[in-house]
């Protein structure tokens, strides 16, 4: 565990000639304030994946009004330091994104406007406990000087905080097997030291600040006796005492949102959703009003001037969550229609629709028939984004320019013999049946029986024709 | 104006080492980095590496980090890099720039080293 | 580290043509790019920086865009003297790197 700290030095209009207007005038007084963004560094992520290693916001620097005439200085800034606590092991090499933002202070209805006035990002080595860096950065016509470093919270020690370290308890040597921590030298390395809490008895570590359940016993700090009665659970090797699987422990194993988040587990990890008034990785980020610039990805805040009173941040399209930190699977809703395909573009939703629709959400079914004659005095039937020919009789094929056997369905029924015919076809009836296709026996008296029974009934059925 | 002014062409030896000067003006020498960057013939630019005038914390390429030094004088305001091991593929133009992380945006006149036994 | 890509690797064009170049980046880069120009004998000179962003002093005719992996630079309308070759420059990552260079010729 430690924490990573960023000091903005300076913020100003870059050299040259073409430097900017103060961002601040007599009519609208402003102040500045900064976010910074952590992710790991070399994560295949996402440009705008959520800041997986934290996120700080400043305070408010000091109000500033430019004076008439003059060039815009390099513009007050708030005290302290921004701070980004990180709970695991410091990764090394990490990617930062500085946002650099406006308040402006003027009569504005609704409260403050903010506007982003620079934002730089980079990717950089970072070894824990090291020196102050130093960097320079220009963004359009600011530039922007900041330092940074990583420092461990004790007892961890070590380039990746990962070492743990204790006061020595005899004054001349450490313990069997334990070093001393350099640059500690009048403290020596602890023995392996599992999770705060992890239970002794049910517990054990193999890396520093893990807690590993032995069998029976769950929960992040191995307090949790495992169920026998319901054995649900498909996570973890199988017990030989119960039969059943014990849970190794999840993401979401004791909850790790805070201030009442609730925690999905995540193909990697965990995602909380926070109640409003709080964010961060673990909604560890409370007393926030609307002055902390809350809603990201350009959301509206509105409400909360004092901690007491929750703000509400009104999302862009595409994104959502208390603090609009979170985007949208928009296509999980199955805009597209007629099976048509849904493309997130981030800044717009697509449907590549299928052959035969068309429109935005592929709703419109084009005209299948236009312009698709059917020969012969066929006619088109239109469906399913295919037109089809319904033929006249002799004639076959897609657009009924076949010539067709009229007697291949064998349309005489009874035993009748079908004779093709310019007109059509002609059936040749089986003694005691009649009729264009033979469809009607014939009684012995000379009278005509009503039609046979339909497809699908048996004779015999108790079905009456009227 | 701003001005980064070289030092004259050199002729080495393999094996020998070359310091070359960048001497800075119209500017105030502190407030921002020397950047080092070199072009072999008819080739690409390629970083070499950086020094901060203020605090003389230096980084570099890891293709020069065990043959590259870099100092500064701020009472001349001039850079020096020391470039040691040389060899043949060492022959290029090297130019000092002046800027941040994310710019150089003044630019010495080059310097021409030439390795050859 | 981070390769750039520019295209094409030479160009022939008139006074007066609109000329586009691009630089591609293995990797997202954000805006961290920059495009200098360098004549023979000449040191580089920077021309945009943070992906669109002039330089104080380069011509309006030289303008930047593009974010993440796939950047542009384009010239309006070609001057005699813009005929020099082109480099792209990352500085998200340590080490900053170069493409190869785009030499831009009178046809």
């Known amino acids: 565990a430690g924490v990573f700290e960023l000091q903005i030095h300076s913020f100003g209009p870059g050299p040259g000639p073409g430097a900017p207007r103060s961002p601040c005038s007599a009519r609208l007084p402003c102040r500045l304030f900064f976010r910074v963004c952590l992710k790991p560094g070399l994560s295949e992520e996402a440009a705008e994946s959520p800041c997986a290693l934290g996120a700080a916001l400043s305070a408010r620097g000091p109000v500033y009004t430019e004076q008439p005439g003059a060039p815009a200085p390099d513009l007050p800034l708030p005290d302290g330091l921004l701070q980004v606590p990180f709970r695991d092991a410091w990764p090394g090499t990490f990617s930062f994104i500085i946002e650099t933002w406006r308040e402006e202070l003027g009569d504005q209805i609704g409260g403050p406007a903010w506007s982003l006035l620079a934002r730089v990002a980079g990717r950089r080595r970072l070894a824990a406990g090291g020196p102050w860096a130093r960097d320079i950065q220009r963004a359009g016509a600011w530039e922007l000087r900041f330092s940074y470093r990583a420092r461990c919270e004790p007892p961890a020690v070590g380039t990746a905080c990962t070492r743990l370290c204790r006061p020595r308890s005899a004054p001349s040597r450490c313990g069997p097997g334990l070093r001393p921590c350099a640059p500690l030298e009048d403290e020596c390395e602890a023995p392996l030291v599992c999770r705060a809490g992890c239970s002794p008895e049910h517990g054990f570590c193999e890396q520093p600040g893990e807690c590993r359940c032995l069998e029976g016993w769950t929960g992040p700090l191995c307090t949790v006796p495992v169920s026998t009665s319901s054995c649900l659970s498909p996570r973890g090797p199988s017990s030989a005492t119960t039969g059943c699987l014990v849970p190794g422990p999840g993401p979401c194993d004791g909850n790790p949102c805070a201030n009442g988040g609730s925690c999905s587990e995540t193909p990697r990890s965990f995602e909380c959703t926070c109640p409003r008034g709080f964010y961060g990785l673990r909604c560890e980020v409370s007393g926030v009003t609307c002055a902390d610039g809350p809603c990201f990805n350009g959301g509206l805040c509105v409400g909360g001037a004092d901690p007491d009173s929750a703000y509400i941040c009104h999302c862009p399209p595409g994104f959502q969550g208390s603090n609009c930190e979170k985007r949208v699977d928009r296509c999980s809703l199955q805009p597209c229609r007629n099976g048509g395909l849904c493309l997130d573009l981030g800044h717009a939703l697509r449907c590549r629709c299928r052959a035969g629709f068309a429109g935005p959400r592929c709703e419109h079914d084009l005209d299948d028939c236009a312009g698709r004659a059917c020969a012969n005095g066929g006619t088109c039937v239109e469906g399913g984004g295919a037109h089809r020919c319904s033929c006249a009789l002799g004639f076959g094929g897609r657009d009924c320019r076949e010539r067709a056997d009229p007697c291949a369905a064998r349309p005489c029924a009874h035993g009748g013999r079908c004779y093709a015919h310019f007109s059509g076809l002609v059936c040749a009836c089986a003694p005691g049946y009649m009729g264009a296709r033979c469809e009607f026996p014939v009684h012995p008296d000379g009278a005509s029986a009503l039609p046979a029974a339909p497809p699908g009934l048996r004779p015999g059925d108790p079905q009456r024709y009227l | 104006q701003v001005q980064l002014v070289q030092s004259g062409a050199e002729v080495k030896k393999p094996g020998a080492s070359v310091k070359v000067s960048c001497k800075a003006s119209?500017?105030?020498?502190?407030?921002?980095?020397i950047h080092w960057i070199r072009q072999a013939p008819g080739q690409g630019l390629e970083w070499m590496g950086y020094i901060n005038p203020t605090t003389v914390y230096t980084e570099f390429n890891h293709n020069f980090k065990d043959r590259v030094t870099m100092t500064r004088d701020t009472s001349t305001s001039t850079v020096y890099m020391e470039l040691s091991s040389l060899r043949s593929e060492d022959t290029a133009v090297y130019y000092c720039?002046?800027?941040?992380?994310?710019?150089?945006?003044?630019w010495g006149q080059g310097t021409t080293v030439t390795v050859s036994s | 580290a981070i390769q750039l890509t520019q295209s094409p690797s030479s160009l022939s064009a008139s006074v007066g043509d609109r000329v586009t170049i691009t630089c591609r980046a293995s990797?997202?880069?954000?805006?961290?790019l920059a495009w200098y120009q360098q004549k023979p004998g000449k040191a580089p000179k920077l021309l945009i920086y943070?992906?669109?962003s002039l330089e104080d002093g380069v011509p309006s005719r030289f303008s930047g865009s593009g974010s993440g992996t796939d950047f542009t630079l384009t010239i309006s309308s070609l001057q005699p003297e813009d005929f020099a070759t082109y480099f792209c420059k990352q500085a998200y990552d340590v080490p900053p790197t170069f493409g190869g260079g785009t030499k831009l010729e009178i046809k």
């Open positions: 119209g500017y105030t020498f502190t407030r921002y980095w």
């Open positions: 943070t992906a669109n």
């Open positions: 990797e997202n880069i954000y805006y961290n």
């Open positions: 720039a002046r800027g941040g992380s994310n710019f150089f945006d003044y």
